[in-house]
C-alpha cells in the first residue's frame, strides 16, 4: 500500500511498531485525489483534543450512570415504602411480615409471567434472526480491515447520536477483496455506496489492497 501518511504519521515514534493506517489517510485519498493535504492540526493538538473528547465522553457516561442510579432509587422508593417500625410491637411486626410475604408472592407471580413473556420473545427473535441468516447465507460477507479509530469515531461510539449534532463524523472506508464482484456487492447492501460514488475511486483500489 502506498504511504499516504499525514504530518502526524511522519513524526518520529518511540518504537518501530507496524504502522496501522489511519482513517484520515483513506479520507485524504477519497476527498483530494491529486494532492496530499497537510494536516492543519499538530499531533500533540490532536492528542489533546482526543483526550478532551474522551473526558467529555467519560463525564457524559458517568452522568448517565448517575441518572440511571437515581431513576432506580426513585422506582424503588415508590415500590418499597420505609418500614416505619417506631411504636409498632411484635404483633404488628408479625402482621407486617405477613403483608410483605403476600406482596413478595404477588411480585414473584408477576415476575414469573414477565419472564415467560421475555423467554417467548427471545425465542421469536432467535427464530427471526436465524431466518435472516438463512436468507443471507448464500452471500459471502467481505472481511473488513481494522483501522486506527479516529477521534470522531471514538466520540460517535461513546456518545452515540449526540455526537452527530456537534461533530463532523465521517464514514470509515473499508478494505475490499479483489474477488468480490459488483453484483455481489450490490446484493450485500449499501456499505460501499459512499466510497464507489467518489470520483476516481476505481483507479485507486490497488492502493487499498496492497
Amino acid at each position: 500500500m502506498a504511504d499516504g501518511s499525514s504530518d502526524a504519521a511522519r513524526e518520529p515514534r518511540p518504537a518501530p511498531a507496524p504502522i496501522r493506517r489511519r482513517s484520515s489517510n483513506y479520507r485524504a485519498y477519497a476527498t483530494e485525489p491529486h494532492a496530499k493535504k497537510k494536516s492543519k492540526i499538530s499531533a500533540s493538538r490532536k492528542l489533546q483534543l482526543k483526550t478532551l473528547l474522551l473526558q467529555i465522553a467519560k463525564q457524559e457516561l458517568e452522568r448517565e450512570a448517575e441518572e440511571r442510579r437515581g431513576e432506580k432509587g426513585r422506582a424503588l422508593s415508590t415500590r418499597c415504602q420505609p418500614l416505619e417500625l417506631a411504636g409498632l410491637g411484635f404483633a404488628e411486626l408479625q402482621d407486617l411480615c405477613r403483608q410483605l410475604h403476600a406482596r413478595v408472592d404477588k411480585v414473584d407471580e408477576e415476575r414469573y409471567d414477565i419472564e415467560a413473556k421475555v423467554t417467548k420473545n427471545i425465542t421469536e427473535i432467535a427464530d427471526l434472526t436465524q431466518k435472516i441468516f438463512d436468507l443471507r447465507g448464500k452471500f459471502k460477507r467481505p472481511t473488513l480491515r481494522r483501522v486506527r479509530i479516529s477521534a470522531d469515531a471514538m466520540m460517535q461510539a461513546l456518545l452515540g447520536a449526540r455526537a452527530k449534532e456537534s461533530l463532523d463524523l465521517r464514514a470509515h472506508l473499508k478494505q475490499v477483496k479483489k474477488e468480490d464482484t459488483e453484483k455481489e456487492n450490490r446484493e450485500v447492501g449499501d456499505w460501499r455506496k459512499n466510497i464507489d460514488a467518489l470520483s476516481g475511486m476505481e483507479g485507486r483500489k490497488k492502493k487499498f489492497e496492497s
Epitope: G87, G89, A91
Partner: antibody
Framework: EVQMVESGGGLLKPGGSLKLSCAAS????????MSWVRQTPEKRLEWVAT????????YYPDSVKGRFTISRDNAKNTLYLQMLSLRSEDTAMYYC??????????????WGQGSSVTVSS | DIQMTQTSSSLSASLGDRVTISCRAS??????LNWYQQKPDGTIKLLIY???RLHSGVSSRFSGSGSGTDYSLTISNLEQEDIATYFC????????TFDTGTKLELK
C-alpha cells in the same frame, strides 16, 4: 405535655358514616405509630385500628376491616378515623392513643379523653 | 384471637391494703402484657408495660409480674386515687385484645 384531643363524634343512623379527628401535641407526632381504641357501653375496651409513624401501614381487627380507615396528616399532627356503614355495635367512646414499644412489646402510653359515637335508628 | 380474662370483675379493698389483680391469656403471650388504669371520669393511663416495666410518672406502689399465660398487677398500700378500673391487654398477636376489666372499690 403529651396531649390528644378527639373530635367529630355524634349521633347517626345505621349505615351512616362519620370521620373522627385527633389533634396531637407535646411530642414529635411523625415519630410515633398511633391507634384508635373504643369502649363499648358495657365498658369493654376494643382495639379498632393502628397506623405506622409515616402512614404506610395500617392494621385493623376483622370487626371493622373494610369499613373503617385510619389515616394521618403528619404536617397537621392529626390522626383520623373514617367510619363507613356504621352499625349499632359501633356505638362506643372512641379514644385516640399514642403507641410506643419496648423490645417488641407495644403499648398505648398516652390516651385522649375520647369522642362519643352513637349509632341508633 | 387471644382471649384475656380476669378472675373477678370487681374487688373491694381498704386503704393501705395490698391488692393483686390477676389476668389470664388463652395462650402464651410471651410477656407482651400491659396494664391500664381507667378513672371514673373516663381518663385512661398506662401503668405497666411488658409485664413488669413501670411507665414514667407512675407510682412505684404499682408492680407487675407473670409469664406464659398468667399475669398479675399488684398495688401495695392502696390509696384513694387508686380507686379505678384496671385492664390488661396482650400485645403478642393481632388483634390486640383487652380483658373486661376489674373494678376496684373501697370496702
Amino acid at each position: 405535655e403529651v396531649q390528644m384531643v378527639e373530635s367529630g363524634g355524634g349521633l347517626l343512623k345505621p349505615g351512616g358514616s362519620l370521620k373522627l379527628s385527633c389533634a396531637a401535641s407535646g411530642f414529635t407526632y411523625s415519630n410515633y405509630a398511633m391507634s384508635w381504641v373504643r369502649q363499648t357501653p358495657e365498658k369493654r375496651l376494643e382495639w379498632v385500628a393502628t397506623i405506622s409513624s409515616g402512614g404506610s401501614y395500617s392494621y385493623y381487627p376483622d370487626s371493622v376491616k373494610g369499613r373503617f380507615t385510619i389515616s394521618r396528616d403528619n404536617a397537621k399532627n392529626t390522626l383520623y378515623l373514617q367510619m363507613l356503614s356504621l352499625r349499632s355495635e359501633d356505638t362506643a367512646m372512641y379514644y385516640c392513643a399514642r403507641r410506643d414499644n419496648y423490645f417488641g412489646s407495644s403499648f398505648m402510653d398516652y390516651w385522649g379523653q375520647g369522642s362519643s359515637v352513637t349509632v341508633s335508628s | 384471637d387471644i382471649q384475656m380474662t380476669q378472675t373477678s370483675s370487681s374487688l373491694s379493698a381498704s386503704l393501705g391494703d395490698r391488692v393483686t389483680i390477676s389476668c389470664r391469656a388463652s395462650q402464651d403471650i410471651t410477656n407482651y402484657l400491659n396494664w391500664y388504669q381507667q378513672k371514673p371520669d373516663g381518663t385512661i393511663k398506662l401503668l405497666i408495660y411488658y409485664t413488669s416495666r413501670l411507665h414514667s410518672g407512675v407510682s412505684s406502689r404499682f408492680s407487675g409480674s407473670g409469664s406464659g399465660t398468667d399475669y398479675s398487677l399488684t398495688i401495695s398500700n392502696l390509696e384513694q386515687e387508686d380507686i379505678a378500673t384496671y385492664f390488661c391487654q396482650q400485645g403478642n398477636t393481632l388483634p390486640l385484645t383487652f380483658d373486661t376489666g376489674t373494678k376496684l372499690e373501697l370496702k
